[in-house]
Interface confidence: low
Amino acid sequence: KEVCYERLGCFSDDSPWSGITERPLHILPWSPKDVNTRFLLYTNENPNNFQEVAADSSSISGSNFKTNRKTRFIIHGFIDKGEENWLANVCKNLFKVESVNCICVDWKGGSRTGYTQASQNIRIVGAEVAYFVEFLQSAFGYSPSNVHVIGHSLGAHAAGEAGRRTNGTIGRITGLDPAEPCFQGTPELVRLDPSDAKFVDVIHTDGAPIVPNLGFGMSQVVGHLDFFPNGGVEMPGCKKNILSQIVDIDGIWEGTRDFAACNHLRSYKYYTDSIVNPDGFAGFPCASYNVFTANKCFPCPSGGCPQMGHYADRYPGKTNDVGQKFYLDTGDASNFARWRYKVSVTLSGKKVTGHILVSLFGNKGNSKQYEIFKGTLKPDSTHSNEFDSDVDVGDLQMVKFIWYNNVINPTLPRVGASKIIVETNVGKQFNFCSPETVREEVLLTLTPC
């Protein structure tokens, strides 16, 4: 079957839209009237209250939309709505760093139904966004390359559909944990893929299989750059007990949403934080997350590391290839940004069994203490570890070393760090030295060699 609409054209239930393994049921999308796609415009001039706009000259001219700015569309996913706080929060953070037309796309008329139907309704949403982009181009000469579409879950595939319909001329699409069911393993026509925009970046946060794990997000790479924070499956802070999950710092409603789909929602929270942390989400090219956690992918290569989230488009190699995979760790609550360091400690003093910790002090801030090694501490041995600091310490000025005994030792041995090398993710090294040794639980300050 096929159904046609005056503005948006025709929609069929033929393969690959239906009747394939991933979507066996022949279902058509609802009508544009029923999906009721709305465009809610926030700008730097109206950051708190949206203006509802339409693909119409008088509507745009009568709004705060400015043609000399970039336009970022944000599309929500299944069951969600365009007035939800998270979309406006993305806009508000954008206004801290740029002048922009920020359009939250509401399609709750089509998202609050069964999942299979909603997965078809995104075709209408994508067509509506494409129509809007093409209208801006024809009416105002506004280039699609100045458009960025950000989509969460099903919204990521709606963004892909908008990009496909505008022949890949949209400047950028960001997929925030694109939905897995009915999309993973489907032909590119159906789902978000790198041909949908000049640049497609993706954040995967809930990549466990839908059966039996209820992972809503895709594990499949679908962009030019695909980021897998914390491995892309289980996000830190999402394994809280039910009560603490629901009684969330952001309120009961956000806590309830988190309880239902914490990993899946983390993607937009990371993106929101990335806007105000231009270097806090460096993604490391790596074979897998296991290799990354084994400390085999540090520092960034000579071409640099892309930033997951808002600043991914600054990566020089962003469109060198498709399916480039990057790994990183984040925090367990906002602020999610982290800065990775490698610390190598050369020991001095007595041979003991214990563990050593180091804290960093720089011109931008100071870190907590991080464990570098646990085991036999032998003089002249060197131990290295990588850790993710919640503070960007900047240029290192000094480090502090402390050690703890694993067993009671009546001889009160002294241990020191003759040299500590700190390496930042861009490969910049800072060397610190001290001839001193200290008893356990005593801080030793090392200064530049």
Epitope: V97, V276, D279, V426, K428
Partner: nanobody, 121 residues
């Protein structure tokens, strides 16, 4: 008010050289990444080169070996030395910087107005 001001653009023959400068002025706490982007009519703004506060540099493939980015952290200035220029390098070159204004905790993304570089064949 923190702002960026570019200079150094102009007309040059293919094979020639130009040096662009971009100075950040105002009440600056610190500057993280600085960079140069270029744009031709009807296209998106593309990264040319970036340099982080630690000195780490990145270049677009099309300019590697020909362009050199550098910065002076005392003068809060970034430079782009462009050698062996080609007609396809013709564009408006925009300076970009992540600037944290004095006594604030957030970095702001700032753009310069742009300077036109024309390479004639």
């Amino acid at each position: 008010q923190v702002q960026l001001q570019e200079s150094g653009g102009g007309l040059v023959q293919a094979g020639g050289s130009l040096r662009l400068s971009c100075a950040a002025s105002g009440s600056i706490g610190s500057i993280h990444t600085m960079g140069w982007y270029r744009q031709t009519p009807g296209t998106e703004r593309d990264v040319v080169a970036t340099i982080q506060d630690g000195g780490s540099t990145n270049y677009a493939d099309s300019v590697k070996g020909r362009f050199t980015i550098s910065r002076d952290n005392i003068l809060n200035t970034v430079y782009l030395q462009m050698n062996s220029l080609k007609p396809e390098d013709t564009a408006v070159y925009h300076c970009n910087a992540d600037v944290r204004p004095y006594r604030t905790s957030r970095y702001l993304e700032l753009w310069g107005q742009g300077t036109l570089v024309t390479v004639s064949s």
